[in-house]
Interface confidence: medium
């Protein structure tokens, strides 16, 4: 028999349950897991099912983004009577099963985290053979990736009326605050964080008018750290040179 499960309840652990007489599917995932970029994270997922002592073919799947339709980032399959869940897909080789599916544990380990990994993940288990059944977490677990600031670009650009402006773009989570310092700017912070503009963890700050030659420094800071980068403005006969 084949059934599509529909989640009916959820508690603080995101325990998703399907109940009917003499059988019960449920999946437990935490609402959120936090980890720092570069580190590893564990995405816990356990389940219960109505098929007592099931030892038939089994597939464990993790998706990203959205349930049921999101792209798979990990998939492994175990043959009947086998505990070896052979990995068929591990995106960029960074995903591996931490749990034992035969013990109803689909927990996943994600290595070398990047800010791009900050999204929601959904676990799924499929039974085949004598029993055909499947279940997927609908709410999933949100992986929150934090990172110290990193300045990804700093530049000087021409602007109207033979003037120059400076741009500084940084990434980090929490999104970093950006500040400029330089000639005639004193010790004051000359710019604040700009809107994120839908670019995920990227933040850009502009210094609209560079009025003096010299070194201009962009500082990016959040709760995890700070980063600095500089550009130099020298005007020769109306031309400019800028270097980082």
């Amino acid at each position: 028999f084949v059934r599509t499960k529909i989640d009916t309840t959820e508690n603080l652990l995101n325990t998703e349950v399907h109940s009917s007489p003499a059988q019960r599917w449920s999946m437990q995932v935490p609402p959120e897991v936090s980890a720092e970029a570069g580190d590893a994270a564990v995405l816990p997922c356990t389940f219960t099912h109505p098929h007592r002592h099931y030892d038939g073919p089994l597939t464990a799947i993790w998706r990203a983004g959205e349930p049921y339709a999101g792209p798979q980032v990990f998939r492994c399959a175990a043959a009947r009577g086998s505990e070896l869940c052979q990995t068929a897909l591990s995106l960029h080789g960074r995903f591996r099963l931490l749990g034992n599916p035969r013990r109803n544990d689909l927990s996943l380990r994600v290595e070398r985290l990047a800010l791009a990994d900050d999204r929601r993940y959904f676990c799924r288990v499929e039974f085949a053979g004598d029993v055909h059944d499947r279940y997927e977490s609908r709410h999933g677990v949100r992986l929150h990736v934090t990172a110290a600031p990193r300045i990804v670009n700093i530049s000087v650009l021409p602007s109207p009326a033979h003037a120059f402006r400076a741009l500084c773009t940084a990434e980090g989570e929490p999104p970093p605050a950006l500040a400029w310092s330089g000639p005639a700017l004193g010790n004051s912070l000359a710019a604040v964080r700009s809107p994120r503009e839908g670019h995920g963890h990227l933040v850009t700050a502009e210094l609209p008018a560079l009025t003096h030659d010299g070194r201009y420094t962009c500082t990016a800071a959040n709760s995890l750290g700070r980063s600095e980068a500089s550009v130099y403005l020298f005007r020769f006969h109306g031309a400019s040179g800028a270097s980082t």
């Epitope: 652990l13 325990t15 449920s26 437990q28 935490p30 897991v33 564990v42 816990p44 356990t46 389940f47 219960t48 002592h53 030892d55 043959a79 009577g81 086998s82 505990e83 070896l84 869940c85 099963l97 931490l98 749990g99 034992n100 599916p101 035969r102 013990r103 109803n104 544990d105 927990s107 380990r109």
Partner: antibody, heavy 117, light 107 residues
């Protein structure tokens, strides 16, 4: 650093009860399944019980089923083993161990339980 | 339930290769884990998922699984490797099973 510290062991009479605790630190306790493993004096390792990260799944060795209960309090980063109807053959060093499909990758130093009259 | 059988003892000269076997029914369809335990200490995981090594474990430790026998191999055995070694796996009934242990003596 990652650490597990067991406590609660001691001398108990046959038929008595004891509750072991395991305090976890240095890692996100709520992300991991946990186990109890014991070792009788001069003997090998024997798995006792397993609990999933959310307490939704628990498993026991046949030798302790119905007598021992594993539990955890994720808010306190603590694992427990309630041992009832203790027998002389339960005498052992009891270890808590972090693990799941990757085996037991972190162990405590153990606590000795002696069942004797 | 599966039973894992290990030789009670294995001896090896320093610098030589030590092999410790672990046999059990249908072991080829299971993950095998190996632990090292020195006197008075807690066990330490040295091999997981049959042939993977945790960080911090020397490269001389390796694992393999063929047929119904898993093997822990220690190449270039050192005096500090003298210890008890245990294999472990899962049973389909959700029981964890350990082998009886092997005492490795470095001569």
């Amino acid at each position: 650093q990652v650490q597990l510290v067991e406590s609660g062991g001691g001398l108990v009479q046959p038929g008595g009860s004891l509750r072991l605790s395991c305090a976890a630190s240095g890692f996100t306790f709520t992300n991991y399944a946990m186990n109890w493993v014991r070792q009788a004096p001069g003997k090998g390792l024997e798995w006792v019980s397993y609990i999933s990260y959310s307490s939704s799944n628990t498993y026991y060795a046949d030798s302790v089923k119905g007598r021992f209960t594993i539990s955890r309090d994720n808010s306190k980063n603590t694992l427990y083993l309630q041992m009832n109807s203790l027998r002389a053959e339960d005498t052992a060093v009891y270890y808590c161990a972090r693990g799941a499909g990757l085996g037991y990758d972190v162990w405590g130093q153990g606590t000795l339980v002696t069942v004797s009259s | 339930d599966i039973e894992l059988t290990q030789p009670p003892s294995v001896s090896v000269a320093p610098g030589q290769t030590a092999r410790i076997s672990c046999s059990g029914d249908n072991l080829r369809s299971k993950y095998v884990y190996w632990y090292q335990q020195k006197p008075g200490q807690a066990p330490v995981l040295v091999i997981y998922d049959t042939n993977d090594r945790p960080s911090g474990i020397p490269e001389r430790f390796s694992g393999s699984n063929s047929g119904n026998t898993a093997t822990l191999t220690i190449s270039g055995t050192q005096a500090e490797d003298e210890a008890d070694y245990y294999c472990q796996t899962y049973d389909m009934t959700s029981q964890d099973v350990f082998g009886g242990g092997t005492k490795l003596t470095v001569l």
